[in-house]
């Protein structure tokens, strides 16, 4: 039975040209994390593998930085970066847990961080 929950940074906003940290945290399970995939809609941004380290997709290499931890930092944000982001935790023996973050990139300087929320 999958008992874990993914806590994410939730709905967040950031200014155009700025950067933002996407963070997920898996709790309430003793399952071993073997890999974390970061995806934007259906595009793979990056993979962090327990044995093999990081792989950043070539098309995002200039704008994505690994970390902190298993998180991902998006840099030089554009309005086109607005949308859904997913952290996909591959674990043993539980299987896959997915967390969702919605990022809105704003033209103005009124960007504020949203509240944290949990996805069971």
């Amino acid at each position: 039975m999958m008992t874990g929950t993914i806590e994410t940074t939730g709905n967040i906003s950031a200014e155009k040209g700025g950067s933002i940290i996407l963070q997920c945290h898996l709790s309430s399970t003793t399952a071993q994390v073997t890999q974390v995939n970061w995806e934007q809609q259906d595009q793979l941004l990056a993979i962090c593998n327990a044995d093999l380290g990081w792989h950043i997709s070539p098309s995002f290499k200039d704008r994505v930085a690994p970390g902190p931890g298993l998180g991902l930092t998006l840099q030089s944000l554009t309005v086109n970066d607005t949308g859904e982001y997913f952290c996909i935790y591959h674990t043993y023996p539980d299987g896959t847990y997915t967390g969702r973050i919605f990022l809105e990139v704003l033209e103005s300087s009124v960007a504020e961080h949203g509240a944290r929320f949990q996805i069971p």
Partner: antibody, heavy 119, light 107 residues
Framework: EFQLQQSGPELVKPGASVKISCRAS????????MNWVQQTNGKSLEWIGV????????NYNQKFRDKATLTVDHSSSAAYMQLNSLTSEDSAVYFC????????????WGTGTTVTVSS | DIQMTQSPASLSASVGETVTITCRAS??????LAWYQQKQGKSPQLLAY???TLAEGVPSRFSGSGSGTQFSLKISSLQSEDFGSYYC?????????FGGGTNLEIK
């Protein structure tokens, strides 16, 4: 104390194979992945590949993909590397070295095994 | 593959001196860099990882710094036991690669 004890030196003929061992002690064998590293002529180090003892998954440096085969034996907490079709260029010291989960540096190294390929 | 270039290849220094070894990566590896020390006929030993975190038991006279593509290892007040070879290794993503090494010898 964490230890990785490797098998003794090997003198092998060109074209032959050799299997060297790395016995782990002082920690949970399946909690750390095992890497193998080649050192030629006491010079620099080259990563050969890694095996995850818990899952049996392997990943190889492209250069060594047809040269090395990595395996583990849980009953003896040992990792093995078989080198095939040996040539004089494979003469080197081979080290096993462990790395932790999401920690991709080598915090404990084996004692080293010298392989000499000569007719 | 990411290439790691170390300099100098060899270095002579006296006990008590301060030396710096540098390592350059062919592409951005952020802070994913480790340093190892190896004595003649022995196995390498981890000195530092994540560019600047010292491994357990490593004396504070060792310090690592850098990020991106440029890194350095500084050894202050050299001790006789510090002489040997030093290697950098990126630990960003496979294949892991090492620098060519720096041989630190007694002057």
């Amino acid at each position: 104390e964490f230890q990785l004890q490797q098998s003794g030196p090997e003198l092998v003929k060109p074209g032959a194979s050799v299997k060297i061992s790395c016995r782990a002690s002082g920690y949970s064998f399946t909690a750390y992945s095992m890497n193998w590293v080649q050192q030629t002529n006491g010079k620099s180090l080259e990563w050969i590949g890694v095996i995850n003892p818990k899952f049996g998954t392997t990943n190889y440096n492209q250069k060594f993909r047809d040269k090395a085969t990595l395996t583990v034996d849980h009953s003896s907490s040992a990792a093995y590397m078989q080198l095939n079709s040996l040539t004089s260029e494979d003469s080197a010291v081979y080290f096993c070295a462990r790395n932790g989960n999401f920690a991709w540096y080598f915090d404990v190294w084996g004692t080293g095994t010298t392989v000499t390929v000569s007719s | 593959d990411i290439q790691m270039t170390q300099s100098p290849a060899s270095l002579s220094a006296s006990v008590g001196e301060t030396v710096t070894i540098t390592c350059r990566a062919s592409e951005n590896i952020f802070s994913y860099l480790a340093w190892y020390q190896q004595k003649q006929g022995k196995s390498p030993q981890l000195l530092a990882y994540n560019a600047e975190t010292l491994a357990e038991g490593v004396p504070s006279r060792f310090s690592g710094s850098g990020s991106g593509t440029q890194f350095s290892l500084k050894i202050s007040s050299l001790q006789s036991e510090d002489f040997g070879s030093y290697y950098c290794q990126h630990h960003f993503g496979v294949p892991w690669t090492f620098g060519g090494g720096t041989n630190l010898e007694i002057k």
